[in-house]
């Protein structure tokens, strides 16, 4: 099956202090390689979450990525702050035999818009 990375929401709004879920699904787990979430693009992009076991404060996976045939790579960001605003991308990599993993596909991005916490 052809690989497609889908981020169904163009944007989400969240009040500061709340949590939000950023959805991402894949149509195939092949080729073998990790899925990572970034905020921003190009040189200035920031790694937000990697489904490879590291710990990321305030960011957790929504479903069990270790389960066989799991295609859901959505994440939850807790205690959102205004600094979390930006566009988030779910990116699929192909594992290289020795060289670094190759970025092969990305979702269309989901903008996180942070609203002031209601007083």
């Amino acid at each position: 099956k052809e690989l497609k990375v889908t981020q169904p929401e163009k944007s989400v709004s969240v009040a500061a202090g709340d949590s939000t879920v950023l959805n991402c699904t894949l149509t195939s787990l092949l080729p073998v390689g990790p899925i990572k979430w970034y905020r921003g693009v190009g040189q200035s992009r920031l790694l937000i979450y990697s489904f490879t076991g590291e710990h990321f404060p305030r960011v957790t996976n929504v479903s069990d990525a270790t389960k066989r045939n799991n295609m859901d790579f959505s994440i939850r960001i807790s205690n959102v702050t205004p600094e979390d605003a930006g566009t988030y991308y779910c990116v699929k990599f192909q594992k290289g035999p020795s060289e670094p993993d190759t970025e092969i596909q990305s979702g269309g991005g989901t903008e996180v818009y942070v609203l002031a916490k209601p007083s």
Epitope: P8, S11, V41, G108, G109, E111
Partner: antibody
């Protein structure tokens, strides 16, 4: 789908103008809407975006702090309040309806001309 | 911000000829790219989205290709109504949404 812009005209630098875009033929509140402009002899420039609910708003740096986008879903109308106008704001302003999945534009109005001149 | 550069600025061709327009992105936008046609006094019209998918009602003489940083809009056989200005737009890196500077296709 029909988008009809109005409110353009000739103003002096520093003055204000309010553009409107009357929408019909689709469920207005379900779509994010944008303003895009084109200066004489120039290309297209994105100006501002507002989500269907009106909760999410973005502006181009060139208009931030001077322009305000809004919408009235009960009237199926999009607005652009333009304050502190400058000569470089002179352009045809288009109202554009976004695709429901991605940020490209399925439908456009004919535009309304704004001229800022002393 | 992703910068889009269109070339050539002007393309002078005869009806029936093939037109090839190029749009280059300063960084990868994958296939998140659209093409529009603009004629004087008319609303801009969406031609292509997703780099290669034709919008509703667009004739099959229009085709799009490319991914990453280089994209092409091809008009296989120019008709009189195709002489216009064409713009590419990326919707991956945002905000802001950015357009190319345009390519004018004019009659020889």
């Amino acid at each position: 789908v029909q988008l009809v812009e109005s409110g353009g005209g000739v103003v002096r630098p520093g003055e204000s103008l309010r553009l409107s875009c009357a929408a019909s033929g689709f469920t207005f509140s379900s779509y994010d809407m944008n303003w895009v402009r084109q200066a004489p002899g120039e290309g297209l420039e994105w100006v501002s975006l507002i989500s269907g609910s009106g909760e999410i708003i973005y502006y181009a740096d060139s208009v931030k702090g001077r322009f305000t986008i809004s919408r009235d879903n009960s009237k199926n109308t999009l607005y652009l309040q333009m304050n502190s106008l400058r000569a470089e704001d002179t352009a045809v302003y288009y109202c554009a309806k976004e695709n429901n999945r991605y940020r490209f534009f399925d439908d456009w109005g004919l535009g309304t001309l704004v001229t800022v001149s002393s | 911000e992703t910068v889009l550069t269109q070339s050539p600025g002007t393309l002078t061709l005869s009806p029936g000829e093939r037109a090839t327009l190029t749009c280059r992105a300063s960084q990868s936008v994958y296939t998140y790219l659209a093409w529009y046609q603009e004629k004087p006094g008319q609303a801009p019209r969406l031609l292509i989205y997703g780099a290669s998918s034709r919008a509703t009602g667009i004739p099959d003489r229009f085709s799009g290709s490319g991914s990453g940083t280089v994209f092409t809009l091809t008009i296989s056989s120019l008709q009189s109504e195709d002489f216009a200005v064409y713009y590419c737009q990326q919707y991956y890196d945002r905000p802001p949404l950015t357009f190319g500077g345009g390519t004018k296709v004019e009659i020889k």
